[in-house]
Amino acid sequence: AWELTILHTNDVHSRLEQTSEDSSKCVNASRCMGGVARLFTKVQQIRRAEPNVLLLDAGDQYQGTIWFTVYKGAEVAHFMNALRYDAMALGNHEFDNGVEGLIEPLLKEAKFPILSANIKAKGPLASQISGLYLPYKVLPVGDEVVGIVGYTSKETPFLSNPGTNLVFEDEITALQPEVDKLKTLNVNKIIALGHSGFEMDKLIAQKVRGVDVVVGGHSNTFLYTGNPPSKEVPAGKYPFIVTSDDGRKVPVVQAYAFGKYLGYLKIEFDERGNVISSHGNPILLNSSIPEDPSIKADINKWRIKLDNYSTQELGKTIVYLDGSSQSCRFRECNMGNLICDAMINNNLRHTDEMFWNHVSMCILNGGGIRSPIDERNNGTITWENLAAVLPFGGTFDLVQLKGSTLKKAFEHSVHRYGQSTGEFLQVGGIHVVYDLSRKPGDRVVKLDVLCTKCRVPSYDPLKMDEVYKVILPNFLANGGDGFQMIKDELLRHDSGDQDINVVSTYISKMKVIYPAVEGRIKFSTGSH
């Protein structure tokens, strides 16, 4: 049997430097994890020890820290080239800065193939982007060849900014002819590498004839066989085995996110290209693995520009931005309004003539707002200021929830009102009225939401059985601050952009801001 080692990453999200265990900023270096310098050490160690090794990335290198804000993808190309990645699939976040923001810094600079079979360019873009990304690539590995076929979430137009000249097709429909083409080229070992989430990864393994292995991303899925080495709870064994419709066992893998782990999968192929065995586990990139000195030196060199950037003015405020806990945990605060407005603005996608936008609502736990910004400093707002407001390095994500779940969330928001607890919700595109004289669980007396399927947005009563899109912090999507109902009942969850980046982009765009307290959250007693 021919043995192939697949090393894989996904959803690295701009974590070029080592991070703390929760993938936020590294504080105590002896406990830090991940980062490209440490990743390189482990990859090189495996390359030296094993004959047939591929290093693959399943998308979403873009977006997540100040590295992306400043370098806009140039850092991704540079360090992925340095690590000698063999292939990458396009993720939804690769389109965050539009198609130009993908072509110039990454597609033109990458020394490795960038893949997606289900993205088709049309119009003037077709010739401009031709050959810069591919549906598949045949890679020589030892004396053999391996076909890598890429795919990207077809939800990308709702999650990012790919523009109107890229069509995102159904993954399975697009992959099958490309795999068939590889088979006609006598390529009998085929890896599907892509960014559509674990459920789609499993469907691809089941439905696409000829795919031997699926390496995925997007859902930040952690798989592990045995006792996991850190805090992540496995969603299943590594590899996760799917039985295909034609009766084959197809290994499916993903490696959590943020460069914390290096996926490590060993596959044995027989002479016909069938997978006769697969085993492995993600490798935790903890401090027992030293950072490679040459890559680390390069990181430090690139780091200098980031320190300069964080003190530069992004825009101005002409009002006090009240991010105090005394306000944001008790009532509508203008910092909450600013952040929610930025969150909605960041998700403006005119994808359907029937809708002015696909999402109109934002919720934000008041406890996530950690600092005010004083306007009496010449009104200047810097990245550094915003990092004090949003210090946790989270993302603002898109979820789909039933109205009934939202109602529960708003009841939870005030179930123990008055104790300065973080679950009090700040909002956008929502008008809520609470009656605190009523018993907990029955305090929401009015809940109106901004329509999306309308030409003139207006507020309508929330419908319990309707499905709504909402932008919220990943902290809430994961059930934080007691919002278990969101985690348990959400119908879809797509991770979004770095929180600080969303707000900084909005402020830069607006140039001067003056958010007000405007009656989004009201309190009544008795009949309202």
């Epitope: 004396d143 053999e144 039985t243 009766g247 002479e271 006769i276 085993h279």
Partner: antibody, heavy 112, light 107 residues
Amino acid sequence: QVQLQQSGAEVVKPGASVKISCKASGYVFSSYWINWVKQRPGKGLEWIGKIFPGNGDTDYNGNFKGKATLTADKSSSTAYMQLSSLTSEDSAVYFCAGFADWGQGTLVTVSA
Amino acid sequence: DIQMTQSPSSLSASLGERVSLTCRASQDIGERLIWLQQEPDGTFKRLIYATSSLDSGVPKRFSGSSSGSDYSLTISRLESEDFVDYYCLQYASSPYTFGGGTKLEIK
């Protein structure tokens, strides 16, 4: 498609040696182990050993060490098994096999 | 060495019947098991690899499964060409070992 073509039947005298061949086609010969298997009526199947043509690595069943010698020629994509000091116990059909595909078998008869 | 105990050694069954053959491994083989079919002329054909993956061109009436150290080959509806010999082979550790075989005969 993958094919393993074995050499024809052999009749050999006790104490002599025999070398049987297995020519591979339809895949990268150097990248996959070739296994050798013995079948005697009423005795089932016995795995003799395997060879990796890429570098000549071999792995023998202890019961066949000294009896079988496995070699491979990359240039002709052919694997060989030599059996030495033959006795009637070595009369059998010998198969070469990948993990998926098998040769048609070579009958070796040891007879005075 | 890992012993593979195959049962039954022979089995009489009727056309259209469902039958199962079993191999028990003496040690853990981690699903690294092949099922082979041998025709009367001596030619071998692999039916199942990695315990349950079906080889291309093999009818879907054949299936493989495992439970603990027991590995099974099931033929859901016997057809006339299925009345031949069957062997399991473990490839988890050297020396690779075969089951003793099952002769499937028509009733």
